[in-house]
Amino acid sequence: FERTRSLQDPCSNCPAGTFCDNNRNQICSPCPPNSFSSAGGQRTCDICRQCKGVFRTRKECSSTSNAECDCTPGFHCLGAGCSMCEQDCKQGQELTKKGCKDCCFGTFNDQKRGICRPWTNCSLDGKSVLVNGTKERDVVCGPSPADLSPGASSVTPPAPAREPGHSPQ
């Protein structure tokens, strides 16, 4: 690597993947193994994140970018940046302190994470239940009984997803 030429800050020419080495007359030295610098002009390289145990490596560390971790199969990330891993449950379940438990009647969970949520209360929108809810799926709301009078179309698209209601229908 060339000695930098900038008169103002000799370190400013050091590219990403290197650091300005004060011990070697401010020569741009490559980042040591297991470290990186993502921007130019750095005076040190940062240590790479290590993905161990419940974490697995999603993206390897390089001289210019940090490693990224996600969770091993059967787990999902919690928090921005995946700072913790939480066990997956099956659809129709939620994770409690006692492990994965089935959703109570009137609630559902269509994912492997998160909590069971109440079925949509169709009557709050003046609609009726077209398809009953299950542990894994919300109810599907259909037209109100009045809409099904003779001459009216008997099929309308289901209502868009909305916040779950407070009582199952």
Partner: antibody, heavy 115, light 107 residues
Framework: QVQLKQSRPGLVQPSQSLSITCTVS????????VHWIRQPPGKGLEWLGA???????DYNAAFISRLSISKDNSKSQVFFKMNSLQADDTAIYYC?????????WGQGTLVTVSA | NIVMTQSPKSMSMSVGERVTLRCKAS??????VSWYQQKPEQSPKLLIH???NRYTGVPDRFTGSGSATDFTLTISSVQAEDLVDYHC?????????FGAGTKLELK
């Protein structure tokens, strides 16, 4: 319910070895790793090592020559052994489940090293 | 090894006061810092993970902030049961390391 229960405290003679068992319930050792952390009286926490779900281990370099962690998945037990204890190894020793951070800890095992 | 330095070592305060505890890492650890509360004769209890994420069941008077090398734990209105020990720890790189702890005491 997730629990980690450690064997009872003990007095260890200088230069002797320490053995602690961490028995877990509410989760499987074939899925989760377990870490060992200690806390000398009135001081901070110190990470000693871990055994991962697959059985491989990582140790703090400061203890690698005298530390051994093993497990028996079928008995839901993790075994911690440290050799050549000295007075400054007096501490509470904890096992904790590997979640990325430590959400579940054992109750701790007080180990006193004294003649 | 990454060194985690907590300050202050101890702090005297009254119930209802706002308190900020600090933790400084010797290297950039991103957001991978956790805060633990430890009551006498008990194991540590996870309060915050990933610098800012409150763990399940932790009261919202506890707030974590910071990234890279500087982290804080703020208790907006200290309750009597909060006057105990607090530890920060980094889960970015092995060996995992912790601060020496901060003790909150009653003024």
């Amino acid at each position: 319910q997730v629990q980690l229960k450690q064997s009872r405290p003990g007095l260890v003679q200088p230069s002797q070895s320490l053995s602690i068992t961490c028995t877990v319930s509410g989760f499987s050792l074939s899925i989760y790793g377990v870490h060992w952390i200690r806390q000398p009286p009135g001081k901070g926490l110190e990470w000693l090592g871990a055994i991962w779900s697959g059985g491989s281990t990582d140790y703090n370099a400061a203890f690698i020559s005298r530390l051994s962690i093993s497990k028996d998945n079928s008995k839901s037990q993790v075994f911690f052994k440290m050799n050549s204890l000295q007075a400054d190894d007096t501490a509470i020793y904890y096992c904790a489940r590997d979640d990325g951070s430590f959400a579940y800890w054992g109750q701790g095992t007080l180990v006193t090293v004294s003649a | 090894n990454i060194v985690m330095t907590q300050s202050p070592k101890s702090m005297s305060m009254s119930v209802g006061e706002r308190v900020t505890l600090r933790c400084k890492a010797s290297e950039n650890v991103g957001i991978y810092v956790s805060w633990y509360q430890q009551k006498p004769e008990q194991s540590p209890k996870l309060l915050i993970h990933g610098a800012t994420n409150r763990y399940t069941g932790v009261p919202d008077r506890f707030t974590g902030s910071g990234s890279a090398t500087d982290f804080t734990l703020t208790i907006s209105s200290v309750q009597a049961e909060d006057l105990v020990d607090y530890h920060c720890g980094q889960s970015y790189s092995y060996p995992l390391t912790f601060g020496a702890g901060t003790k909150l005491e009653l003024k």
